[in-house]
Interface confidence: medium
């Protein structure tokens, strides 16, 4: 796969994943629960990171936000933080990667600058994806271990709601948002990895492109006291050599204009 294709695909995959992370964060169905189920009426409670909702088979639906921070579990706060961090990093990653795309020319930005930006955006996407996956997994663990509070207990900090305590500890099941979050986090992670791989293709590898020219002129002798500097580049002061024009010539033969290069 070409570098441009890898970079472009990585960007698109990350973009889709990022959109999924936002969707999962905003969704109400992080956990679902059958409150009441009989042949006449079914009542479902589903909770998100920001609000709790109730839906009945009759069509009635009501959602209410968590207006307080005091009554909310610390784990829920942590999940919120992880998802927000993931979104913020994703936004930065997208902005950076737009400028890093090889197919987009911005001024005189060279490949090495684009490579650095591609790597940066790739790392940002990877961290963003990891944040989302961890956030969703922490929430899922809360459900599995039955740590999640009952509907009534969720609002204990909201102006006298503490009196509303359900005696039965209710078990919630995984909501759609968890699966969206896992997939989205995975896609963002994969996209980030692809961006990092594309970065390697964009980076000019110095070790592979050290150009050493061979001249027919009489100025260059076969042997110098400093070692085989002219022919092999392993002279005593080779450490300070710079590469010009993508490895076209070394500092030592800056004045000469060779016609043929050997890459060692």
């Amino acid at each position: 796969m070409s570098v441009t294709a890898c970079q472009g695909l990585g960007f698109v995959v990350s973009l889709i994943g990022f959109a999924g992370i936002i969707a999962a964060t905003c969704m109400d169905q992080w956990s679902t629960q059958d409150l009441y189920n009989n042949p006449v009426t079914a009542v479902f409670n589903y909770q998100g990171l920001w609000r709790s909702c109730v839906r009945e088979s009759s069509g009635f639906t009501e959602c209410r936000g968590y207006f307080t921070l005091l009554g909310l579990p610390a784990m829920l706060q942590a999940v919120r933080a992880l998802m927000i961090v993931g979104i913020v990093l994703g936004v930065i990653g997208i902005l950076v990667s737009i400028f890093a795309l090889k197919c987009i020319r911005i001024g005189s930005m060279d490949d090495s600058a684009k490579a650095k930006m591609t790597l940066t955006s790739g790392i940002l996407f990877i961290i963003s994806g990891i944040c989302a996956i961890i956030g969703v997994s922490v929430f899922a663990n809360m459900l599995v271990t039955n740590f999640w509070m009952s509907t009534a207990n969720m609002y204990s900090g909201m102006g006298g709601m503490g009196g509303m305590v359900q005696t039965v500890q209710t078990r919630y099941t995984f909501g759609a948002a968890l699966f969206v979050g896992w997939v989205a986090g995975g896609l963002t992670l994969i996209g980030g990895v692809m961006m990092c791989i594309a970065c390697r293709g964009l980076t000019p590898d110095d070790s592979n492109f050290k150009a050493v020219s061979y001249h027919a002129s009489g100025q260059n002798v076969a042997y110098r006291p400093g070692g085989f500097k002219a022919s092999t580049g392993f002279g005593s002061n080779t450490r300070n050599k710079k590469i010009y024009d993508g490895g076209a010539r070394t500092e030592d033969d800056e004045q000469s204009h060779p016609t043929k290069y050997d890459y060692v």
Partner: nanobody, 122 residues
Framework: EVQVQESGGGLVQAGGSLRLSCAAS????????VGWFRQAPGKEREFVAA????????NYADSVKGRFTISRDNAKNTAWLQMNSLKPEDTAVYYC???????????????WGQGTQVTVSS
């Protein structure tokens, strides 16, 4: 702590009307949805109607749709159940309850009144 108290029950002829009131004490009344439930002798408690905390949405049992109307005034800490075209089968003890959602699920409601008797004679 919120406390609710129903009033307005009584004996009425079939086809008649009654208006039940639910008065709540406590500043947090506006935080709660208000639900009305009823229990006839020898039967389970059943959902009648509910109104959301803001009054913006209502929920009715199929058996009372079009006949009963629920409303509230948060400034007065009061909710009402206007019952029209009453039938003998509407005879029951009517309970007012405060909960987080205006759902038909009685487990959602944490605060309950003592109930008021409504009798519809044929």
């Amino acid at each position: 702590e919120v406390q609710v108290q129903e009033s307005g029950g009584g004996l009425v002829q079939a086809g008649g009307s009654l208006r039940l009131s639910c008065a709540a004490s406590g500043r947090t009344f506006s935080n709660y949805a208000v639900g009305w439930f009823r229990q006839a002798p020898g039967k389970e408690r059943e959902f009648v109607a509910a109104i959301t905390w803001s009054g913006g949405s209502t929920n009715y049992a199929d058996s009372v749709k079009g006949r009963f109307t629920i409303s509230r005034d948060n400034a007065k800490n009061t909710a009402w159940l206007q019952m029209n075209s009453l039938k003998p089968e509407d005879t029951a003890v009517y309970y007012c309850a405060g909960g987080f959602f205006a759902t038909s699920y009685s487990g959602n409601y944490g605060y309950w009144g003592q109930g008021t008797q409504v009798t519809v004679s044929s």
